[in-house]
């Protein structure tokens, strides 16, 4: 049996292809015959799924040119706030345990985009853990007017997350140090494994596998909402939007954004992956009479898609009656 | 042709365990993956584990985790499907079944002609 | 695991009609599907791949269609040989998973 390949590398040159490359083993074992390639779909990231985006001022931003991930600081005006009474000097209010534990899961989430795509090289993934599959209770489906707390990581269980495991799948090489695969995900890691096999492979088996693990390049596109937002009315002044999830986005969809107004598209609402996984959509609420339009745009791990075409609806005045009623 | 043959019909006790063949004839083994795919009576297919005779490399479902073992032998071009802590639900035909090509792993376009396995007290 | 649905559960058709059956993922699987045709004591044959493809020596009266969540095979005219229990397949995650059957009986 031969030994391991050697330097085993992989780059990515589109959405869906890895390029492979390696080098013979040092101890081929006999006449070198071919090499089996073996690649698997890596799960992402369990917090990815359960971090809340909607409620940081902050989005992951893709470099491009080194593979990293920054984190992009909305900033607003600053509040001046007042601590010491009406005239006394203004000092740092003492921090809630809410604020304490907000700081450490900001502190998480940073080191996860950090270290998230570092120089495009990957160390091999521990064991991951079985979870608890959780309900959240009481999830609202606005997140404009919820205060940042603990709650920023969702318990929720995606079922993407859950368990999820991917094939193998095989291709073999002959002759050659180098291999393209195809068909791939935009935006996705993959482990690749590389077996050396001699004249001897189909009796006495080929070598163990050198592997390296890579990440596709995104699709352009590939995060735009495919089909059309529609809407129902609901009570008390709101309405349902729906749309469809982008059925292969790049790497995975963190979270939607709606514009909407009535005459100009001024409001914005956040909808998290957890809340769309939920219900299919967002409701908005405290809506006054009249005509909107709204767009909807997802952000995945690479950026944003395209906003969707406004979708038109309309908000009922109450008649006297039911003012009356209520 | 390629022809996959399985041992014949087993009748086991509960907790106890079996073993089912699956060899190759007519054409190359080692290189192929081999699964294994179990259907009970008037019920559909479950697929339970494979393995990559040449690299030797198994891989099972999570349900089956920890009491199937799937191994093979080169010199004889067989698969073996080894199942334990039997239970009266493990009553089925098993199937070996060959992936149709390396590079369309997964579908199955070879199959043995399967091997009723019954548990019974 | 991805949970594949199909339906109807039987069918009844005439030799000679079309009959058209539907398989639903409870997740998307893109195109990673496959239609196998499994006769009373017989081990099932492959059909159709990558939710088109027809497998070698598959008589052109067979073929698939769908990506995502929805399929479809369609047998464009019966012959008697068709009627048999058709599956389909996921083999986009771990575990492998079949559909529960769809029974295509004489009318």
């Known amino acids: 049996v031969p030994s391991i390949p050697l330097d085993v590398l992989s780059a990515s040159n589109s959405s869906s292809q890895l390029i492979v490359k390696w080098n013979p083993p040092s101890l081929p074992n006999g006449n070198l015959s071919y090499y089996i390639v073996r690649w698997q779909r890596q799960p992402q990231d369990g917090y990815l799924y359960r971090h809340n985006y909607c409620s940081k001022d902050k989005i992951p931003i893709r470099k491009y040119a080194d593979g990293t991930i920054d984190i992009e600081e909305v900033t607003e005006n600053p509040k001046t706030e007042v601590c010491g009474g009406e005239k006394g000097p203004c000092c740092a209010c003492p921090k809630t345990e809410a604020e304490k534990q907000a700081e450490k899961e900001e502190a998480e989430y940073r080191k996860v985009f950090e270290n998230f795509l570092h120089n495009s090289i990957f160390v091999p993934r521990p064991e991951r853990k079985r979870r608890d599959v959780m309900q959240v209770a009481n999830t609202t489906m606005s997140s404009r007017s919820r205060n940042t707390t603990a709650a920023d990581t969702y318990n929720i269980t995606d079922p993407e997350e859950l368990e999820t495991e991917y094939p193998f799948f095989e291709s073999r090489v002959d002759n050659k140090e180098r291999t393209v695969i195809s068909n791939l995900r935009p935006f996705t890691l993959y482990r690749i494994d590389i077996h050396s096999c001699n004249h001897e492979a189909e009796k006495l088996g080929c070598s163990a596998s050198n592997f390296v693990f890579a990440r596709t390049m995104p699709a352009e596109g590939a995060d735009d909402i495919p089909g059309p937002v529609t809407w129902e009315p609901r009570p008390e002044n709101s309405i349902f939007l729906k749309w469809p999830e982008p059925e292969n986005p790049n790497g995975l969809i963190l979270m939607y954004e709606i514009k909407y107004g009535s005459q100009v598209e001024d409001q914005r609402e956040c909808v998290s992956r957890q809340e769309y996984r939920k219900y299919g959509g967002a409701k908005l609420n405290r809506l006054n009479p009249g005509n909107y339009t709204a767009r909807i745009q997802a952000t995945s791990l690479s950026g944003n898609g395209s906003w969707t075409d406004p979708v038109f609806f309309y908000v009922q005045a109450k008649t006297g009656y039911e003012n009356f009623i209520h | 042709q390629v022809q996959l043959q399985q041992s014949g019909a087993e009748v086991k006790k509960p907790g106890s365990s079996v073993k089912v063949s699956c060899k190759a004839s007519?054409?190359?083994?080692?290189?192929?993956?081999i699964s294994w795919v179990r259907q009970a009576p008037g019920q559909g297919l479950e697929w339970m584990g494979r393995?990559?005779?040449?690299?030797?490399?198994?891989n099972y479902a999570q349900k089956f985790q920890g009491r199937v073992t799937i191994t093979a032998d080169k010199s004889t071009s067989t698969a073996y499907m080894e199942l334990s802590s039997l239970r009266s639900e493990d009553t089925a035909v098993y199937y070996c079944?060959?992936?149709?090509?390396?590079?369309?792993?997964?579908?199955?376009?070879?199959w043995g002609r399967g091997t009723l396995v019954t548990v019974s007290s | 695991e991805i949970v594949m649905t199909q339906s109807p559960a039987t069918l009844s058709v005439s030799p000679g009609e079309r009959a058209t059956f539907s398989c639903r993922a409870s997740?998307?699987?893109?195109?990673?599907l496959a239609w196998y045709q499994q006769k009373p004591g017989q081990a099932p044959r492959l059909l159709i791949y990558?939710?088109?493809n027809r497998a070698t020596g598959i008589p052109a009266r067979f073929s698939g269609s769908g990506s995502g969540t929805d399929f479809t095979l369609t047998i464009s005219r019966l012959e008697p040989e068709d009627f048999a229990v058709y599956y389909c397949?996921?083999?986009?995650?771990?575990?492998?998973?079949f559909g529960g059957g769809t029974k295509v009986e004489i009318k």
């Open positions: 397949q996921q083999r986009s995650n771990w575990p492998l998973t």
């Open positions: 990558d939710a088109s």
């Open positions: 393995i990559i005779p040449i690299l030797g490399i198994a």
């Open positions: 079944a060959r992936d149709h090509r390396f590079d369309y792993a997964w579908y199955f376009d070879l």
């Open positions: 007519g054409g190359t083994f080692s290189s192929y993956a």
């Open positions: 997740q998307s699987v893109g195109s990673n």
